[in-house]
């Protein structure tokens, strides 16, 4: 069983999860119209189900295109300082949380980046939810 | 870094068919739109054809229309331009461009070497 | 398809120069217009993008401007690297990419 020492562990790695995707979402939020407009022309997958922590696999799967896409949009002669530190910190995150089991991602649909972002925030949203109460 | 490398040109017979090909690296390939432009010998730079990220959309430019395919291979992470019924004003440069997009507005942000394509009879 | 105008077609400057490059769009294109330089033998380089956007690497004697249908390209002080032709070229009439004929910067 859980310890209270390994629940709150996992708790703190989710709310840091949850800020460095908020941090991203804004990021892209506050582009200016043509480079959002380009911005959402890309494609992310989004996987069938994201119910549980092991399904985390997914959203790292997908962190490489994520960062190619933020820092184009960035511009490529500002460092992308923000960007590269927030993708290393969910990298970071997700390994811890994602645990040593493997799991194989189904991927249903592709969706945009902010979608992309907003369902990542929604699946961590609710398993801090779950776990506090 | 990344690279895009045309191959396949080369001398052809009016009517006869050709076709390029383009490998990609240093990108996640599968998230972005990819070009054909060419140009003319001292000529300047004409749009070709495009296609979408996963292959779902293509476009041409009038000229071509019916007669050069734009394709891909996202496992392969290469790109294709098959040319049929070629003509003497197909004879180009033809470059394999990439667009910060997946689909829609964008402009060329890396381009290849291109490779050259001679319609002679 | 829009037209893009590019003229004068060839240009002569001396180096340290300050050189506008203008570009005309037949109609409205927004801020949807990018810059190559091409010099012989070789594959354009990506300049500007969105009207004054710099691309990667480029240094900053390099300034687009504009919006609409009047747009320019701007070299501050002009270097013996600099002497080429360039392009301006419109992505709003999706996917009617169309490009001007093309600038040459020679040298005076």
């Known amino acids: 069983a859980p310890t209270s020492s390994s629940t709150k562990e996992t708790q703190e790695q989710l709310d840091q999860l949850l800020l460095d995707l908020q941090v991203l979402l804004k990021g892209v939020n506050d582009y200016k119209n043509s480079k959002l407009s380009r911005m959402l022309t890309f494609k992310f997958y989004m996987p069938k189900k994201v119910t549980e922590l092991k399904h985390l696999q997914c959203l790292e799967e997908e962190l490489k295109p994520l960062e190619e896409v933020l820092n184009l949009a960035q511009g490529k002669n500002s460092h992308g300082g923000n960007t590269r530190e927030s993708i290393s910190n969910i990298n970071v995150t997700v390994l811890k949380l994602k645990g040593s089991e493997t799991f194989m991602c189904e991927y249903d649909e592709t969706v945009t980046i902010v979608e992309f972002l907003n369902r990542w925030i929604t699946f961590c949203q609710s398993i801090i939810s779950a776990s506090s109460s | 870094q990344v690279q895009l490398v045309e191959s396949g040109g080369g001398l052809v017979k009016p009517g006869r068919s050709l076709r390029l090909s383009c490998a990609a690296s240093?990108?996640?390939?599968?998230?972005?739109?990819m070009s054909w432009v060419r140009q003319a010998p001292g000529k300047g730079l004409e749009w070709v054809a495009m296609i979408s990220f996963d292959g779902g959309n293509q476009y041409y430019t009038d000229s071509v229309s019916g007669r050069f395919t734009i394709s891909r291979d996202n496992s392969k992470t290469t790109l294709f331009l098959q040319m049929d019924s070629l003509r003497t004003e197909d004879t180009a440069v033809y470059y394999c461009?990439?667009?910060?997009?997946?689909?829609?507005?964008?402009?060329?942000?890396?381009w290849g070497q291109g490779t050259l394509v001679t319609v002679s009879s | 398809d829009i037209q893009m105008t590019q003229s004068p077609s060839s240009l002569s400057a001396s180096i340290g120069d300050r050189v506008t490059i203008p570009c005309q769009a037949s109609?409205?294109?927004?801020?949807?217009l990018s810059w190559y330089q091409q010099k012989p033998g070789k594959a354009p380089k990506p300049l500007i993008f969105?009207?004054?956007d710099l691309e990667t690497g480029v240094p900053s004697r390099f300034s687009g401007s504009g919006s609409g249908t009047d747009f320019a390209l701007t070299i501050s002080s002009l270097r013996p690297d600099d002497f080429a032709t360039y392009y301006c070229h419109q992505y709003h009439d999706y996917p009617s990419y169309t490009f001007g004929h093309g600038t040459k910067l020679e040298i005076k």
């Open positions: 240093g990108f996640t390939f599968n998230r972005y739109a």
């Open positions: 969105d009207a004054s």
């Open positions: 461009v990439r667009s910060p997009a997946g689909d829609w507005v964008a402009y060329f942000d890396y």
């Open positions: 109609e409205d294109i927004s801020n949807h």
